[in-house]
């Protein structure tokens, strides 16, 4: 399975969209997990609503939000207020009973804000406009990269 690389700026939001066959995955919840090492388990971060018909509702765990458009076949994960510690390998998963099928592997890279490397002494930013919450701007570039990470469940 190819790994998609997404880059986001520290402090901003990064949106990940995983597409799937809506009929094949009918009735299945989706999850976003973080892979622990190249061959380690995938640790659940957040999953969609327990009632599949309500999967369109946003579910949050900390700064990570997930929502599933089950008709279109797109699950969207938003990593808000991106931090350096958020960098790493993740998976979008489709859950069926006790099985987890990998829909997509995503490598998240966090870029430091160039302003952090300068003396921003006289720069003033209003507090309410520094968050980018709700804008969900995909401040990222993406590319495909072949990796040898095995699928995990």
């Amino acid at each position: 399975l190819n790994t998609t690389v997404l880059q986001g700026m520290a402090g901003q939001s990064l949106r990940v969209s995983c597409t799937y066959d809506a009929l094949k995955h009918w009735g299945r919840r989706k999850a976003w997990c973080r892979q622990l090492g190249e061959e380690g388990p995938c640790q659940r971060v957040v999953s969609t609503h327990g009632v599949w018909l309500l999967a369109f509702l946003k579910k949050r765990n900390g700064s990570t939000v997930i929502a599933d458009d089950t008709l279109a076949g797109t699950v969207t994960i938003t990593l808000k207020n991106l931090q350096a510690g958020d960098a790493g390998l993740y998976q979008c998963q489709s859950l069926r009973g006790r099985e987890a099928e990998v829909l997509q592997k995503v490598l998240v890279e966090v870029l430091e804000d160039p302003l952090d490397d300068q003396d921003a002494g006289d720069l003033w930013v209003p507090e309410e406009s520094s968050s980018f919450e709700g804008a969900q701007v995909e401040h990222s570039t993406s590319r495909n990269q072949e990796t040898s990470f095995p699928p995990t469940s």
Epitope: D21, L23, G27, W52, L53, G97, R98, E99
Partner: antibody, heavy 122, light 108 residues
């Protein structure tokens, strides 16, 4: 009417190859998983594997992995079970069945074929 | 793999009696992924119950399913002559989607 129609009975010799079929009709064949189940004479049901005809995603039981091949041709709404080299112990009734689903769960195998008898004898 | 164990192997009852069939899983199974089937001699199996307790289309209400975790039960409230058959449980919670060994309900 939703139905699965299987190919006819087969009599084969050990070492021969065989491909049996299961044709679906009355529903969207590509959007339901199709499973295969073995029943040896006088015995219970054994789950062999399952295929999603839409993209040919296939799962096997470890007991049957490498022993049989499950495939599908969505253009003619047909799933297949094949052997490259039959053994006497493959003598059994083989059923195909549709795996249904509902919102948030699974319907089990809700439509079954009539079964195909395979006899392997020298 | 999850091993499904059915008991008793054979149940000898008379028409009109209540039949209680047990199915035990070697590890916990989500009730959404537990089904029961009926098979008569010379016929393909027929789905009776899915999701542990939901009756399949056309199945009479004398058939009911219950249970959760590792213990599941199929109950036939009043046996009709056509109910004498072999019954199988199956889990499709985790591949391979194993069947139980079956319970034969025979006429006493």
């Amino acid at each position: 009417e939703v139905q699965l129609v299987q190919s006819g009975a087969e009599v084969k010799k050990p070492g021969e190859s065989l491909k049996i079929s299961c044709k679906g009709s009355g529903y969207s064949f590509t959007t339901y998983w199709i499973g295969w189940v073995r029943q040896m004479p006088g015995k219970g049901l054994e789950w062999m594997g399952i295929i999603y005809p839409g993209d040919s995603d296939t799962r096997y039981s470890p007991s049957f992995q490498g022993q049989v091949t499950i495939s599908a041709d969505k253009s003619i709404s047909t799933a297949y079970l094949q052997w490259s080299s039959l053994k006497a112990s493959d003598t059994a009734m083989y059923y195909c069945a549709r795996a249904g689903h509902y919102d948030g769960g699974h319907l089990g195998m809700d439509v079954w074929g009539q079964g195909t008898t395979v006899t392997v004898s020298s | 793999e999850i091993v499904m164990t059915q008991s008793p192997g054979t149940l000898s009852l008379s028409p009109g009696e209540r039949a209680t069939l047990s199915c035990r899983a070697s590890q916990s199974v989500s009730s959404s992924y537990l089904a029961w089937y009926q098979q008569k001699p010379g016929q393909a199996p027929r789905l009776l119950i899915y999701g542990a307790s939901s009756r399949a289309t056309g199945i009479p209400d004398r058939f009911s399913g219950s249970g959760s975790g590792t213990d599941f039960t199929l109950t036939i409230s009043r046996l009709e002559p056509e109910d004498f058959a072999v019954y199988y449980c199956q889990q499709d919670d985790r591949s391979p989607y194993t069947f139980g060994g079956g319970t034969k309900v025979e006429i006493k």
